[in-house]
Interface confidence: medium
């Protein structure tokens, strides 16, 4: 197989080095020749020629292949011209010759993938590998080949991507800094707690890929899918040169699903304790796990230890809403929080679902606000509410919804950020229900919506005749 990798080498005498401490040279002869016919001689400048011990192997339909492996590491020297020539001993003739630099004929053995597992975000995959010759790993670049493992379609799309070793994996940005909040003050960003539509994943060809030494992070994969992957390496062409080696044996990995599918929502009320909840699946049990990470970059060869999230009793606040599983844990404000939910179905199959990582200050849930009103004139209401958290008044936004009695549809209003009240024009002689909810959405704190306040019933007065 390695011979085929050297096919583009037009030299009759082909040579390669796996680790730059070894050298193998070979050539093919169509005609069979008696043992001892050929000698492979080599010499560095100003040194006496030496013979390299030859072995031969019969090549069906091709004749004989003669192979020499340099016997001593001390004989394999870099950045220095090595003269090689094949001599027919009986005819005292040079059959073929070449001059090469060992540092330019690298053909690295494939790395062995030692771990492949989901990364810290849905659709991410972290892999680690072991380099057969670790001392040269700084001078190699890597290429990854992967594709979806689909038993029904063995010719699924394959992606080949060069691993960019100079970048660590993407920093876990604080999602949605102030600049992301320009539209409406309460525009719902895609947050770990968002129970909204799944974002479309980037096309596989655009999958981001980064590496750090012997580990690499791929993103943009489809959560919940299975993938196969292979790795190969090539000298970087700066210090050491050569060709791409062969691909490693394929490994397969099952990516966790996206916990958005379970409606995962995590929040804190006190910036100390975090509660997570997700929809309970039919005929299945589930368990939440968490871990904290300080690393903004991919930790090399470090795999998280997931801790149990302490279960709470199942809640079923209303018949229409699905039953939720809840759990809670103590958190820290100096690290990123990662959540995993494992769902075990009746036959005992375990499905994992990964939440998007978040900081505790991005998951602050406010208490339900209190709504007060008074009618100034017929149908003209003045509304007032207390900020549930005075410490973040300027970062609190509200939604007010109302509906006429007997109506199912709600009208939703968004007062300006930080407002403490407002006015509302309603039809006279009508009955309404009003509700208010709040959430943090500023540069310091963000979080999910509070629950809606208890419905406030309003009956507007008859029009006053002037």
């Amino acid at each position: 197989q390695d011979v085929s990798l050297l096919a583009s080498d037009s030299e009759p005498l082909k040579c390669f080095s796996r680790t730059f401490e070894d050298l193998t040279c070979f050539w093919d002869e169509e005609e069979a020749a008696p043992s001892g016919t050929y000698q492979l001689l080599y010499a560095y400048p100003r040194e006496k020629p030496r013979a390299c011990p030859l072995s031969s192997q019969s090549m069906p339909h091709f004749g004989t292949r003669y192979v020499c492996q340099f016997p001593d590491q001390e004989e394999v020297r870099l950045f220095f011209p090595l003269h090689l020539w094949v001599k027919n001993v009986f005819l005292n003739q040079t059959r073929t010759q070449r001059v090469l630099f060992v540092d330019s004929v690298g053909l690295p053995a494939p790395p062995s993938i030692i771990k492949a597992m989901g990364g810290s975000q849905p659709g991410e995959l972290q892999i680690s590998w072991e380099e057969p010759a670790p001392e040269i790993s700084d001078f190699l670049r890597y290429e990854l080949r992967y594709g979806p493992r689909d038993p029904k379609n063995s010719t699924g799309p394959t992606v080949i991507q060069l691993i960019a070793t100079e970048t660590c994996c993407p920093a876990l940005q604080r999602p949605h800094s102030a600049s992301a909040l320009d539209q409406s003050p309460c525009a719902q960003p895609t947050m770990p707690w968002q129970d909204g539509p799944k974002q479309t994943s980037p096309s596989r060809e655009a999958s981001a890929l980064t590496a750090e030494g012997g580990s690499c992070l791929i993103s943009g994969l489809q959560p919940g899918n299975s993938y196969w992957l292979q790795l190969r390496s090539e000298p970087d062409g700066i210090s050491l040169g050569g060709s791409w080696g062969s691909w490693s044996l394929p490994v397969t990995v099952d990516l966790p699903g996206d916990a958005v599918a379970l409606g995962l929502q995590c929040f804190t009320l006190d910036l100390k304790n975090v509660t997570c909840q997700w929809q309970q699946q039919d005929h299945a049990s589930s368990q939440g796990f968490f871990y904290h990470s300080r690393a903004r970059c991919c930790p090399r060869d470090r795999y998280p230890i997931w801790e149990n999230c302490e279960e709470e009793e199942k809640t079923n606040p209303g018949l229409q809403t699905p039953q939720f599983s809840r759990c809670h844990f103590k958190s820290r404000n100096d690290s990123i929080i990662h959540i995993l939910v494992e769902v075990t179905t009746a036959p005992g199959t375990v499905h994992s679902y990964l939440g998007s990582p978040f900081w505790i200050h991005q998951a602050v849930r406010l208490p339900t606000p209190n709504l007060h009103w008074r009618e100034i004139s017929s149908g003209h209401l003045e509304l007032e509410w207390q900020h549930p958290s005075s410490w973040a008044a300027q970062e609190t936004c509200y939604q007010l919804r109302y509906t006429g009695e007997g109506h199912q549809d709600w009208k939703v209003l968004e007062p300006p950020l930080g407002a403490r009240g407002g006015t509302l024009e309603l039809r006279p002689r009508s009955r309404y229900r009003l509700q208010l909810r709040a959430r943090l959405n500023g540069p310091t704190y963000q979080g999910p919506w509070s629950s809606w306040s208890d419905p406030t019933r309003v009956e507007t007065a008859t029009e006053t005749a002037w």
Epitope: E21, F79, E135
Partner: antibody, heavy 128, light 108 residues
Framework: QVQLVQSGAEVKKPGSSVKVSCKAS????????ISWVRQAPGQGLEWMGQ?????????WLAARANSRVTITADESTSTAYMELSSLRSEDTAVYYC????????????????????WGQGTTVTVSS | EIVLTQSPGTLSLSPGERATLSCRAS???????LAWYQQKPGQAPRLLIY???SRATGIPDRFSGSGSGTDFTLTISRLEPEDFAVYYC?????????FGQGTKVEIK
């Protein structure tokens, strides 16, 4: 981390000899070359020669200095020496020893000495 | 012997500016064996870059090296007051080892 420590300043008469030492700490001499470089006042850097430690000691000298320079080493003390004879006033310079990879190193030799390391310099003044 | 020619001889720049120093070899040099040094008056040369592009220990990342074959470049992305000095390139892949004549980077 290899460090090279050189002997102190010397003042010499024309026609005499000077022997400058360069001691390696934190590593042995094998696997790399000790080069000698000099810099006359206000001038650039001039390579004088090197001693290559390996299976056999090999001395390489720049053509200009050839006959007057001798480079030796004492492996037991990890010290290299550069002796310059028949001193002239134009030999007044700062003499540096530098550890560099050998020519045609094995991979391990190259990895051990990829980054050059220099001594602090020895000032030699030749004056009557 | 391989002759290294540095250009320009003198570079007059202000702090904060970008400096680009060139080193041209009379024949091909292995990238693994090209180094850049900084030297200030009365001091030994200080290794900045080895192997054409690898930064030596403790060298700030405003210094970067590039190039291969016969053309090599040292770039200082933003000159700091302490960067004004003489810079030498050196090849140590082929005996005799040789140095460029130096480029002086001075304050404008």
């Amino acid at each position: 981390q290899v460090q090279l420590v050189q002997s102190g300043a010397e003042v010499k008469k024309p026609g005499s000899s000077v022997k400058v030492s360069c001691k390696a700490s934190g590593g042995t001499f094998s696997s790399y070359a000790i080069s000698w470089v000099r810099q006359a006042p206000g001038q650039g850097l001039e390579w004088m020669g090197q001693l290559i430690e390996g299976p056999t000691l090999r001395q390489w000298l720049a053509a200009r200095a050839n006959s007057r320079v001798t480079i030796t080493a004492d492996e037991s003390t990890s010290t290299a020496y550069m002796e310059l004879s028949s001193l002239r006033s134009e030999d007044t310079a700062v003499y540096y020893c530098a550890r560099l990879p050998i020519e045609g190193p094995t991979l391990r030799q190259w990895l051990a000495a990829r980054a050059p390391v220099w001594g602090q310099g020895t000032t030699v003044t030749v004056s009557s | 012997e391989i002759v290294l020619t540095q250009s320009p001889g003198t570079l007059s720049l202000s702090p904060g500016e970008r400096a680009t120093l060139s080193c041209r070899a009379s024949q091909s040099v292995s990238s693994s064996y090209l180094a850049w040094y900084q030297q200030k008056p009365g001091q030994a040369p200080r290794l900045l870059i080895y192997g054409a592009s690898s930064r030596a220990t403790g060298i700030p990342d405003r210094f970067s090296g590039s190039g291969s074959g016969t053309d090599f470049t040292l770039t200082i992305s933003r000159l700091e007051p302490e960067d004004f000095a003489v810079y030498y390139c050196q090849q140590y892949g082929s005996s005799p080892w040789t140095f460029g004549q130096g480029t002086k980077v001075e304050i404008k």
